[in-house]
């Protein structure tokens, strides 16, 4: 028997992936466990193997189809179960009725690039990845810029309250190395959370022209 508290959290990327984390105090180290997804109104079901990510938590990704295919809609409810092997049978360790579009976490933005850089400003663009056509333009973004001598945690957050896949960073210091990250969140979903941060984009502002005021 397993004692202790269990937490089972999943997010849908809005297209064809449900990522789950299962945490269990006093957990079974050498037991094989999996997540099983059973939609209420689809002909398919899906399973993934839970792999350890820390002492007492496991994670896996349910791949529902091709990355950009719309495998679930807002009407679907998916029964998600954690099943662990006990001898010759499987035991249900956790279960939830999962509303995919109430529990969204999109993929991190991709293809970050510097569109134009000057001494004091830099224009950066990006793309969203595997985001449902359902959202239309109703997405928001957060961005942050890493300045020399600071940490990401200290970087102020810039909020873009609409689907705007570019930003113009102002009041930068000439001839200085920066890094930039962005993340995305749909407005839809009670338990929706921010995507992971994008891979950092490194850029350098242009040096100030000699003999000129900057």
């Amino acid at each position: 028997a397993v004692n202790g508290t269990s937490q089972f959290t999943c997010f849908y990327n809005s297209r064809a992936n449900i990522s789950c984390v299962w945490s269990q105090d006093g957990a079974l180290q050498d037991t094989s466990c999996q997540v099983h997804a059973w939609p209420d109104r689809r002909r398919w079901n899906q399973t993934c193997e839970l792999l350890p990510v820390s002492q007492a938590s496991w994670a896996c990704n349910l791949i529902l189809g091709a990355p950009d295919s719309q495998k679930l809609t807002t009407v679907d409810i998916v029964t998600l179960r954690v099943l662990c092997r006990e001898g010759v049978r499987w035991r249900v360790m956790a279960i939830q009725d999962f509303k995919p579009f109430e529990n969204l976490r999109l993929m991190a933005p991709i293809s970050l690039q510097v569109v134009h850089v000057e001494t004091h400003r830099c224009n950066i663009s990006w793309e969203i990845s595997q985001a449902s056509h359902y959202f239309e333009r109703h997405l928001e973004f957060e961005a942050r810029t890493l300045s020399p001598g600071h940490t990401w945690e200290e970087a102020p957050l810039l909020t873009l309250k609409q689907k705007q896949e570019w930003i113009c960073l102002e009041t930068l210091t000439p001839d200085t190395q920066y890094e930039f990250q962005v993340r995305v969140k749909p407005l839809q979903g009670e338990f929706t959370t921010w995507s992971p941060w994008s891979q950092p984009l490194a850029f350098r502002t242009k040096p100030a022209a000699l003999g000129k005021d900057t």
Partner: antibody, heavy 117, light 107 residues
Framework: EVQLVQSGAEVKKPGATVKISCKVS????????IHWVQQAPGKGLEWMGW????????EYAPGFQDRVTITADTSTDTAYMELSSLRSEDTAVYYC??????????WGQGTTVTVSS | EIVMTQSPATLSVSPGERATLSCRAS??????LHWYQQKPGQAPRLLII???QSISGIPARFSGSRSGTEFTLTISSLQSEDFAVYFC?????????FGQGTKLEIK
Amino acid sequence: EVQLVQSGAEVKKPGATVKISCKVSGFNFKESLIHWVQQAPGKGLEWMGWIDNEAGETEYAPGFQDRVTITADTSTDTAYMELSSLRSEDTAVYYCARGGPWFLSYWGQGTTVTVSS
Amino acid sequence: EIVMTQSPATLSVSPGERATLSCRASQIISNNLHWYQQKPGQAPRLLIIYGLQSISGIPARFSGSRSGTEFTLTISSLQSEDFAVYFCQQSNNFPWTFGQGTKLEIK
């Protein structure tokens, strides 16, 4: 500019079938959802269903499920709503609208359907 | 299905004054509530999504708020073009349902 232009008014006899068209422009029809909404005289709005042109799926409200069929022709950027076994209480204005699944962002001008013997 | 109840059925307000329209859900719908405006002979127009998010192009005098299952649409200073019927709509439980509407008329 987003536009949804619906076909003209219809007069039908009880038991007949009506088919309304909704020609769209100004957005990618193949990646859109088109909803249909009924507004009967003196009554509120009633959501009937949608077609998801990208996924190729339809959803219908239970109250209309047995009698409504929503289709789309992506070659002409036109959606259709067919309502069968018409009765007098189906006399209403019918709207097509574009949106995500959750709300309706842009609406057609409406098509009046009168059911009378 | 979820029943959406709007109150009052008719609201009489003078131009320049504030109007407060209410929409109550028969069960918890999180923030999945959207507001529309409909003028006579016209199609509805989307105003507010998710209880409080304004749609671009909608004047700033329109705002939304939520307290539990009760949602409020506030028009801070009524203009002549604001007199219309207002509908709320929930998208929490399928099928989506609308309120019966509040008619906002000139006092």
